[in-house]
């Protein structure tokens, strides 16, 4: 059976760059170590954003450099992604990668568009 | 670039052991998960045996099961498949193979044959 | 393990036409999960379509996949000299991963 991953059509970062959405999964098998990693597609070229492997129950460890953070509850990811700019608006692709016990599965989500919008700078103040 | 370069191929007789190595380069290889595909004289593909990111969860098929072992060295950029008990069933070009980000194979190397024959 | 069945086994076909391969699985794969590759004699098999229908970087768009479930499609449009070879579905969603037994593509 493939699996079947979830995610919102549409996301807003609010004004300081920053976006959260939930990746959800079908979990075809009862999975103890799981990697979720959020990809970018823009054209059709596509690049990792960030990625974490995890224990179920155990929290998301991101790389520090990372500009995702996450929590994970069941077969539910949330997802956390800072520091964006209007350069980075595009499609977010979250794919789920079920790595233990046997069988291996994966899933990919049909990706979230993230919009961002850069604040104004403040008017100076006389 | 992205390279796949598969070297250790060669004529051994059944019963003995091998060991293939695959070089990467042009790009982060501990990003990626890999594979080794086979392919007999004259036939289809065959999926043999997979590796995860960082080595620890390993997937292989039943006909190579408890004989072959994929390892990386994640340090050097280096996929491996040692080979154990061959059997002539198991002449084949052998080729390493990147998953890409959405799942598919997609770069290979150029395959290393592989003649288990006495 | 998921079975993937291709036919024809072979196709003689002249360049200019239209080549239509199947790929059929025995059991549901989803869409995003069903590869093609090509395989030229002395070289290794190349990603032409992923995701049942996207090409993959530089693949002329001739090429196009389509299906869903358990039933998919390569089909190549207007046959080149280049396309002649052997086509291989995949199924890549869970283990094993899994092969067709390839559809050669022959001139007629």
């Known amino acids: 059976k493939a699996m079947h991953v979830a995610q919102p059509a549409v996301v807003l970062a609010n004004s300081r760059g920053t976006a959260s959405f939930v990746c959800e999964y079908a979990s075809p098998g009862k999975a103890t170590e799981v990697r979720v990693t959020v990809l970018r597609q823009a054209d059709s070229q596509v690049t990792e954003v960030c990625a974490a492997t995890y224990m179920m129950g155990n929290e998301l460890t991101f790389l520090d450099d990372s500009i995702c953070t996450g929590t994970s509850s069941g077969n539910q990811v949330n997802l956390t992604i800072q520091g964006l700019r209007a350069m980075d608006t595009g499609l977010y692709i979250c794919k789920v990668e079920l790595m233990y016990p046997p069988p291996y599965y994966m899933g990919i989500g049909n990706g979230t568009q993230i919009y961002v919008i850069d604040p104004e700078p403040c008017p100076d103040s006389d | 670039q992205v390279q796949l370069v598969e070297s250790g191929g060669g004529v051994v007789q059944p019963g003995r052991s091998l060991r293939l190595s695959c070089a990467a380069s042009g790009f982060t290889f501990s990003h990626y998960t890999m594979h080794w595909v086979r392919q007999a004289p004259g036939k289809g593909l065959e999926w043999v045996t997979f590796i995860s990111y960082d080595g620890n969860n390993k997937y292989y098929a039943d006909s190579v099961k408890g004989r072959f072992t994929i390892s990386r060295d994640n340090s050097k950029n280096t996929l491996y498949l040692q080979m154990n008990s061959l059997r002539a069933e198991d002449t084949a070009i052998y080729y390493c193979?990147?998953?890409?980000?959405?799942?598919?194979?997609?770069?290979w190397g150029q395959g290393t044959l592989v003649t288990v024959s006495s | 393990e998921i079975v993937l069945t291709q036919s024809p086994g072979t196709l003689s076909l002249s360049p200019g036409e239209r080549a239509t391969l199947s790929c059929r699985a025995s059991?549901?794969?989803?869409?995003?999960?069903l590869a093609w590759y090509q395989q030229k004699p002395g070289q290794a098999p190349r990603l032409l379509i992923y995701?049942?229908?996207s090409r993959a970087t530089g693949i002329p768009d001739r090429f196009s996949g389509s299906g869903s479930g358990t039933d998919f499609t390569l089909t190549i449009s207007r046959l080149e000299p280049e396309d002649f070879a052997v086509y291989y579905c995949q199924q890549y969603g869970s283990s094993p991963w899994t092969f067709g037994q390839g559809t050669k593509v022959e001139i007629k």
């Open positions: 995701g049942a229908f």
């Open positions: 059991q549901e794969v989803g869409e995003s999960y």
């Open positions: 193979a990147r998953t890409g980000w959405l799942g598919p194979f997609d770069y």
